[in-house]
């Protein structure tokens, strides 16, 4: 008796973080024996969608012509072969930005910081939110989450960095979100350029949890060493 069918591969183009109204294509790649592909979305009636395979039958395309809240969420796909259904793919999380107005990102005391000193990035939203995310451009795993305890709503989140090194320099943006859907984010804040000056090159901080075994300098997560802010927010690494 043959073992279970290998699980398909699921991905999104141009990516898995999509602005409201933009198009996105979800691809599911199985085997040449596939007769049908099925896409399921977590917490939604199944099947979410079904497609016939594209020649040579090893993948299927699921098109979203205009991204809306309905499409944000966690997906898995399957394929059916003559011997039955495959294992589910690894999940794909499709995130929509533009669900809420953009927050403001600032640096305290200044976006120009001397190496070895401290800086705090402050993300502020006009309306109370319970999740804030800090994103660094060109980082492979750029998300740093602050989520409020017990669903308490906050107008801001602090991301302290200390001691600052040259690795912390770069362009940052932040997003805000409500806990009822982690897949719906605000518009991005305007970018903030953090400039680290100083001739003394500090040793790079050792992350307590590395994100990638083959991580380069831009792939490290932000590792603020200050205490978690007193705003009732809790830090989550993505």
């Amino acid at each position: 008796q043959a073992g279970p069918l290998p699980k398909p591969t699921l991905w999104a183009e141009p990516g898995s973080v999509i602005s409201w109204g933009n198009s996105v294509t979800i691809w599911c790649q199985g085997t040449l024996e596939a007769r049908e592909y099925r896409l399921d979305k977590e917490e939604s009636p199944a099947p979410w969608d079904r497609q016939n395979p594209l020649e040579p039958k090893n993948k299927a395309r699921f098109s979203i012509p205009s991204m809306t809240e309905d499409y944000a969420g966690r997906y898995r796909c399957y394929y059916r072969s003559p011997v039955g259904w495959s294992q589910p793919s690894d999940p794909l999380e499709l995130v929509m930005t533009g669900a809420y107005s953009k927050p403001t990102l600032s640096a305290l005391p200044s976006p120009l910081v001397t190496s070895g000193k401290s800086v705090t990035l402050l993300c502020q939203s006009r309306s109370p939110m319970d999740t804030f995310l800090l994103i660094k451009e060109r980082a492979a795993h750029p998300l740093l989450h602050l989520r409020s305890e017990h669903g308490a709503q906050q107008h801001q989140a602090e991301f302290p960095m200390s001691p600052v090194t040259s690795v912390h320099g770069g362009t940052y943006r932040c997003f805000s979100s409500h806990g009822f859907s982690h897949y719906l984010l605000s518009h991005p804040s305007d970018p903030l350029e953090l400039i680290v000056s100083g001739s003394l090159e500090d040793p790079r901080p050792s992350p307590t949890r590395s994100v990638s075994t083959a991580a380069g300098p831009e792939d490290q997560p932000l590792m603020p060493t200050g205490s978690v802010p007193h705003s009732g927010l809790r830090r989550h690494w993505e």
Partner: nanobody, 121 residues
Framework: EVQLVESGGGLVQPGGSLRLSCAAS????????MGWYRQAPGKQRELVAA???????KIGDSVKGRFTISRDNAKNSVYLQMNSLRAEDTAVYYC???????????????WGQGTQVTVSS
């Protein structure tokens, strides 16, 4: 060949209840989300409720707390239980089947002929 057959419509007083049934062919029922739309005269068709093969449901905002949907795999049938009916629930109710994304796009793959529900005293 008729693949979705509705029954259970009729005239009911405000505050009353009705149960709509939809029988489907096994091939359609076993692989699709089943659901109900309604269309009142001069109004747009709206999704009332849907239920997946995983038994997860979606209930339209206008009927939440009053209508429930269920499916019976042994009978290849889906049911819409309508309680606390109001005059504004008067419409032709259509059974539909397809992938859920088609329900969101108001274009399921299969449709029934419809059954009239009239709520009036």
């Amino acid at each position: 060949e008729v693949q979705l057959v509705e029954s259970g419509g009729g005239l009911v007083q405000p505050g009353g209840s009705l149960r709509l049934s939809c029988a489907a062919s096994e091939s359609i029922f076993s692989s699709n989300v089943m659901g109900w739309y309604r269309q009142a005269p001069g109004k747009q068709r709206e999704l009332v409720a849907a239920v997946g093969i995983n038994r997860l449901t979606k209930i339209g905002d206008s009927v939440k707390g009053r209508f429930t949907i269920s499916r019976d795999n042994a009978k290849n049938s889906v049911y819409l239980q309508m309680n606390s009916l109001r005059a504004e629930d008067t419409a032709v109710y259509y059974c539909a089947a397809g992938a859920y994304v088609r329900f969101l796009q108001q274009s399921p793959d299969y449709w029934g002929q419809g059954t009239q529900v009239t709520v009036s005293s």
